[in-house]
């Protein structure tokens, strides 16, 4: 039978090294065996390149295309082929379809004044256009209470968030994850980072513990818990 595309390719770029296109066929397809996505930058002398797609699901194909450090003017011509049959043709401008890279290395540290310091890394090198454009969303949730979650928007430059321990339930295990977007590029959100988990220990003031006692308790609890849940 003839090969048909059910949902045409949708593409996003991380605006540094990779563009990813995904599409859905009208029936289960061995993407790598049956299909090829050709792409060519609309620029004098540019060669045609071929991407071999992989299956994401039975009928969903995905292609990851290496690109040079993207600039606003870049436009790619895309052609989806099944052998000699052209299934779809379109163009793609990476700067208009940005999905930032996922923030990395999310960690939680006890900090002064009964706060937790959440830190992560900007996924872009300083010379990249997106490095200074990212804002972040941090999701903090109670591992045992789905109703207990908070969302923080980090719109300042530094990839950090200070969290008052008093805003979280004492003795509860919390997980945090972070994602990024680039407002000036009207990007989509990045994927969520892997979660990091920690045990919140906050003794209310009426317990009459001194600041140092509380901070030491936090540090001890955090270190013990961190060794048990190092890669959650």
């Amino acid at each position: 039978g003839s090969v048909k595309v059910l949902h045409e390719p949708s593409c996003f770029s991380d605006y540094i090294s990779t563009s990813v296109c995904q599409w859905k066929m009208d029936h289960p397809t061995n993407c790598s065996a049956e299909l090829r996505l050709s792409y060519q930058l609309d620029f004098m002398g540019s060669e045609n390149h071929t991407c071999v797609p992989e299956n994401r699901e039975d009928s969903v194909c995905v292609c990851s295309m290496p690109i040079d450090d993207a600039v606003e003017a870049d436009v790619y011509q895309l052609d989806l082929w099944a052998g000699q049959q052209l299934l779809w043709s379109g163009s793609f401008q990476p700067s208009k379809h940005v999905k930032p890279r996922t923030p990395g290395n999310l960690t939680v540290h006890p900090n002064i004044s009964h706060t937790w310091l959440l830190m992560w890394t900007n996924p872009y090198p300083t010379e990249n256009h997106l490095h200074s454009e990212l804002t972040y969303m941090v999701n903090v949730s109670n591992d045992n209470d789905p109703e207990d979650f908070k969302v923080y928007n980090v719109t300042y430059m530094g990839p950090t968030l200070r969290l008052a321990a008093s805003t979280l339930k004492s003795g509860a295990s919390y997980s945090a994850r972070v994602r990024a977007w680039a407002q000036t590029y009207n990007s989509t959100w990045s994927d969520w980072s892997p979660s990091t988990t920690w045990l919140n220990y906050y003794e209310p003031w009426e317990q009459h513990l001194g600041l140092n006692d509380i901070f030491e308790a936090q540090k001890i609890e955090w270190h013990e818990h961190h060794h048990h849940h190092h890669h959650h």
Epitope: M44, G45, S46, E47, H49, V71, A73
Partner: antibody, heavy 125, light 112 residues
Framework: EVQLVESGGDLVKPGGSLRLSCVAS????????MTWVRQAPGKGLQWLSL????????YYADAVKGRFTISRDNAKNTLYLQMNSLRAEDTAVYYC??????????????????WGQGTLVTVSS | DIVMTQTPLSLSVSPGETASISCRSS???????????LDWYMQKPGQSPQGLIY???KRASGVSDRFSGSGSGADFTLKISRVEADDAGVYYC?????????FGQGTKLEIK
């Protein structure tokens, strides 16, 4: 050392044909686009044609489109310009030159960074 | 097609002085920030052209730092400081962004 050596220039009658060759050495020929430029006696430079490193993409000036064909043989490190339906106004020195690096997704540009010595084509009856 | 216009068409400069040649294109040659597809070439009588400047301001390998290129968009300038007798020749600008590529008419530099 990078070298480009053109050959094939000759005296030819109007309406005739000629094939110019440009043998390259000293650089990875297949990675670079190549260009032909000509210069009529006492005149300025005129760009004629470009071919990508693989030979998959070609471009032409309007003045020669449909009459001239650019091609390359990467196994022989040789660039060609097939010239048909030649006219008196095609009389010129023809230069080949190394153009942009096309093995990258966006070609890397260094201008026409090396030129051959030129070969003279004279079209006259 | 992009038209390249050079001024002046001829220039006479004394040794040690600075020569300045302008090149204007009918369309912007800026592809992205820092990427202006404008070159400068020099041709001496009876010789092949040689590249001086590419991407608006980058000196080709082996070219003296007396040669400098500047500009963006559609306006570019080649400056030759401390002109020497050996600098005599014809200077061409060329756009390398859009097909068909195109050269300016050339500027003849004469040393007094």
């Amino acid at each position: 050392e990078v070298q480009l050596v053109e050959s094939g220039g000759d005296l030819v009658k109007p309406g005739g044909s000629l094939r110019l060759s440009c043998v390259a050495s000293g650089f990875p020929f297949r990675d670079y686009a190549m260009t032909w430029v000509r210069q009529a006696p006492g005149k300025g430079l005129q760009w004629l044609s470009l071919i990508s490193g693989s030979g998959g993409k070609t471009y032409y000036a309007d003045a020669v489109k449909g009459r001239f064909t650019i091609s390359r043989d990467n196994a022989k490190n040789t660039l060609y310009l097939q010239m048909n339906s030649l006219r008196a106004e095609d009389t010129a020195v023809y230069y080949c030159a190394v153009d942009r690096l096309t093995k990258t997704i966006r070609p890397q540009y260094y201008g026409l960074w090396h030129w051959g010595q030129g070969t003279l084509v004279t079209v006259s009856s | 097609d992009i038209v390249m216009t050079q001024t002046p068409l001829s220039l006479s400069v004394s040794p040690g002085e600075t020569a300045s040649i302008s090149c204007r294109s009918s369309q912007s040659l800026t592809y992205s920030i820092g990427y202006n597809y404008l070159d400068w070439y020099m041709q001496k009588p009876g010789q092949s052209p040689q590249g001086l400047i590419y991407l608006g301001s980058k000196r080709a390998s082996g070219v003296s730092d007396r040669f400098s290129g500047s500009g963006s968009g559609a306006d570019f300038t080649l400056k030759i400081s401390r002109v020497e007798a050996d600098d005599a020749g014809v200077y061409y600008c060329m756009q390398g962004l859009h097909s068909p590529l195109s050269f300016g008419q050339g500027t003849k530099l004469e040393i007094k």
